[in-house]
Amino acid sequence: KKVVLGKKGDTVELTCTASQKKSIQFHWKNSNQIKILGNQGSFLTKGPSKLNDRADSRRSLWDQGNFPLIIKNLKIEDSDTYICEVEDQKEEVQLLVFGLTANSDTHLLQGQSLTLTLESPPGSSPSVQCRSPRGKNIQGGKTLSVSQLELQDSGTWTCTVLQNQKKVEFKIDIVVLAFQKASSIVYKKEGEQVEFSFPLAFTVEKLTGSGELWWQAERASSSKSWITFDLKNKEVSVKRVTQDPKLQMGKKLPLHLTLPQALPQYAGSGNLTLALEAKTGKLHQEVNLVVMRATQLQKNLTCEVWGPTSPKLMLSLKLENKEAKVSKREKAVWVLNPEAGMWQCLLSDSGQVLLESNIKVLPTW
């Protein structure tokens, strides 16, 4: 008996071939011997089966001795043995219809779980293997679960269902809702304008939700809400904003915030959360601000940084085009009685300069 695998919702074509290459009488029946369809001369006739409105054939092939049964919009319960009667012969085809669906929405927040459920006909024992967009393979039976979805899991999942040495392939598009970056650091000299951007890693036609940026300044004992906003059809509207700093927020995506100037009291780290409509949980992005200040007070030239710096970062003071006078893995360095000239304060990571501030020391007479 020939086995054909079908996909729920798809169309399947079961073949039936006569030895004579001409139009002759044929009938398709199900395992209960109920007529599905057949012909009367050149006319298609239908029986009282449940498939009535979804069954068809290809009249153009009848003259060649081919009498296919086409079943549209397949359902799991269409799984059955179909019998084609032609020329006193009976051709049997076993149709097995499978469905594969994501348990909830196909738009999931980063860190959430994805469960794929296989619908299969009674008596079948299929195996399923799915390949994620990043090439990860998972295997299972009726259900497959992936916990802690990552950004790279966004895209088309390809799942193969295997039954009786036959296979059918499903493609499911999964969108992982997340920010493009989990964390970012902005390095600024004191007084410079600061821009924070929070690009999303997905696009949807209508995006609605609400968000908030909490800020923990290095100098402050507790965190504070800097801004709250709503998102309606991709339009950002600010609901409440702190008066210090004087923040501005862009009205269109990507989410974007600006501070008029970087000051030591703003250095620290923030957490932007975005709650999307009809989704449980929130998207998060951490943002850090490091501020540098170079000052000369009497005979002391000082360079300081505030904010979350890694212990391996190097802070240096050097006279232009000369070797560093002082270099330390600390957040403040100074030079007593500095020579006249243009001094540079550098914050660097393995030789790469992250932040630079210049200060001119005038000669003392």
Epitope: Q193, N233, E235, Q248
Partner: antibody, heavy 119, light 107 residues
Amino acid sequence: EVELLESGGGLVQPGGSLRLSCAASGLTFSTFAMSWVRQAPGKGLEWVSGISGSGENTYYADSVKGRFTITSDNSKNTLYLQMNSLRAEDTAVYYCAKEGYNWNYMDVWGKGTTVTVSS
Amino acid sequence: AIQMTQSPSSLSASVGDRVTITCRASHGIRNDLGWYQQKPGKAPKVLISETSSLQSGVPSRFSGSRSGTDFTLTISSLQPEDFATYYCLQDYTYPYTFGQGTKLEIK
């Protein structure tokens, strides 16, 4: 072709009220954000008020906050600006403008309607 | 509100000249800035959106650029029909703000 036509301007005494209308043709009104922009005689352009396509969010310049109200009627494809407690400095040509999809810029402007506040 | 400082307020130039007009934003506004041309008695017309996107039908002699919070409109070779008043507009956030305008006159 998209067209905007303002009406409702005229002469009004200080402290009085006026309602400006902007009838739009050739567009699905609820899709686009709209704005009112004014220009006092011999002066530059001043953005006055804006409304999101859905009509849910409204915005105002500080100079008119609390006195002006922007609304829209999607069924009539019409934008309104209710102006109360009018002052001499509100004298201007008032333009309505449609914003591009995704709020890129004000791509279509009306010809303007003149409001004169004088005793 | 974000302030837009436009300069110069007026400018005399000749046909064929290269002209630049600048706008400085008091806050970072990404590329959310447009340039508008207005002729006497007429409504403004958009020339450039999002800092540098030339609108359809606008001659290629008009161009826009940005450096930080400084935005520039350049007309590479002035034509007689370019004598008008030019405004920048930040549409980064509400309330929107225009620059004070630059009146471009024939020398």
